[in-house]
């Protein structure tokens, strides 16, 4: 019987470092090895018939035990499939190796209204583009961490908001007077130093009533 396997199905490596993606196989007399890269809608062939393809040949080397990168970039993050077949035969096996290229978060950008109307919906956003894996976000009001559920802490029990740590969106609905304050957010992805945005003050103002 044929086997195709990797003892490292997930590899995490800091950007600009070398890395090897392992693929061990047995039971093939004349193995033909191919490596495919998948990331979202993108699919690329890295290795075809035991040879690295032109788009990778300057930085990837084929070895009988896997493929080795001289230096990885964030664009290399994705799933690599090692596919082994018998030349001229019908034996086939494959194994997937997930590569996560680690990049620390950059300073997050916030979108916070300087004033918002009490009783209305107010949307605050926080995002950063560099972090790999993608960052999770924590919001602060006046330097205090905002819990995901406002009712869980006395300090925020009068607030009504929904906080999404994955998207970085903070939605007040409805906004109350006590939501006035200085807001900032922190991005962290478990690699490198967490980064904090600038703090921006939001005033919760009464609705203008026409005379």
């Amino acid at each position: 019987s044929v086997t195709v396997h990797s003892s490292e199905p997930e590899v995490r490596i800091p950007e600009n470092n070398p890395v090897k993606l392992s693929c061990a196989y047995s039971g093939f007399s004349s193995p033909r090895v191919e490596w495919k890269f998948d990331q979202g809608d993108t699919t690329r062939l890295v290795c075809y018939n035991n040879k690295i393809t032109a788009s990778y040949e300057d930085r990837v080397t084929f070895l009988p035990t896997g493929i080795t990168f001289k230096s990885v970039t964030r664009e290399d993050t994705g799933t690599y499939t090692c596919m082994v077949s018998e030349e001229g035969g019908n034996s086939y096996g494959e194994v997937k190796v997930k590569l996560i290229v680690l990049v620390p978060p950059s300073k997050p950008t916030v979108n916070i209204p300087s004033s918002a109307t009490i009783g209305n919906r107010a949307v605050l956003t926080c995002s950063e583009q560099d972090g790999s894996p993608p960052s999770e976000y924590t919001w602060f009001k006046d330097g205090i961490v905002m819990p995901t559920n406002p009712k869980s802490t006395r300090a925020f029990s009068n607030s009504s908001y929904v906080l999404n740590p994955t998207t970085g969106e903070l939605v007040f609905d409805p906004l109350s007077a006590s939501d006035t304050g200085e807001y900032s957010c922190e991005a962290r992805n478990g690699y490198g130093t967490p980064m904090t945005s600038n703090a921006v003050r939001m005033e919760a103002v009464e609705r203008n009533v026409g005379v």
Epitope: E8, V19, K20, L63, T68
Partner: antibody
Framework: QVQLVQSGAEVKKPGASVKVSCKAS????????MHWVRQAPGQRLEWMGY????????RYSQKFQGRVTITADTSTSTAYMELSSLRSEDTAVYYC?????????WGQGTLVTVSS | AIRMTQSPFSLSASVGDRVTITCKAS??????IAWYQQKPAKAPKLFIH???TLQSGVPSRFSGSGSGTDYTLTISSLQPEDFATYYC????????FGQGTKVEIK
């Protein structure tokens, strides 16, 4: 035939560092990752980390991260394992082992004794 | 991390006995287990890989079996040269050894 020959026994004081070598022959050194495994007296074998000699890429066990450094010299087909901030619990036999998927060939082992 | 629990810790047997050593993984390891023999002051020696594939030169009295989380090394008829310590290794996801089984003369 494949051979892995390690350096001789070492006696070190707590806080010091030790560097053990492993010279490979009988195969293409850059084709296979080289791992280090240790065995403290009466204990199970414990995986420490490895190096891909082709590009110098390393991976370490979380337990040893920050204290172990594995390097390779392709010109002499030699892998090295350096362990720093030694303590008495680091007294063990240290092995290098070639990886196919499992470990198929091992060095003879190097006894490192940490004693004040 | 995958944990490997090997049993028994030690066993006493006589020449000609049938000996069984087991290894239990903390999760399914998809048959990616190897067995090593180690004699005093020597390096471990690969005996079996991928559950049941005998390494070249290993006597046929050694066999391996199992699936999922439970695996077994069997020596059908113990010989004098088989007295040693045996270790299992899972290599499905990184590498973890069992604690070893010492096979002693009764």
């Amino acid at each position: 035939q494949v051979q892995l020959v390690q350096s001789g026994a070492e006696v070190k004081k707590p806080g010091a560092s030790v560097k053990v070598s492993c010279k490979a022959s009988g195969y293409s050194f850059t084709d296979y990752s080289m791992h280090w495994v240790r065995q403290a007296p009466g204990q199970r074998l414990e995986w420490m980390g490895y190096i891909d000699p082709y590009n110098g890429g390393t991976r370490y066990s979380q337990k040893f991260q920050g204290r172990v450094t594995i390097t390779a010299d392709t010109s002499t087909s030699t892998a090295y394992m350096e362990l720093s901030s030694l303590r008495s619990e680091d007294t063990a036999v240290y092995y290098c082992a070639r990886q196919t998927d499992y470990f198929d060939y091992w060095g003879q082992g190097t006894l490192v004794t940490v004693s004040s | 991390a995958i944990r490997m629990t090997q049993s028994p810790f030690s066993l006493s047997a006589s020449v000609g006995d049938r000996v069984t050593i087991t290894c239990k993984a903390s999760q399914d390891i998809n048959n990616y287990i190897a067995w090593y023999q180690q004699k005093p002051a020597k390096a471990p020696k690969l005996f079996i890989h991928y559950t049941s594939t005998l390494q070249s030169g290993v006597p046929s009295r050694f066999s391996g079996s199992g699936s999922g989380t439970d695996y077994t090394l069997t020596i059908s008829s113990l010989q004098p040269e088989d007295f040693a310590t045996y270790y299992c290794l899972q290599y499905d996801n990184l590498w973890t050894f069992g604690q070893g089984t010492k096979v002693e003369i009764k």
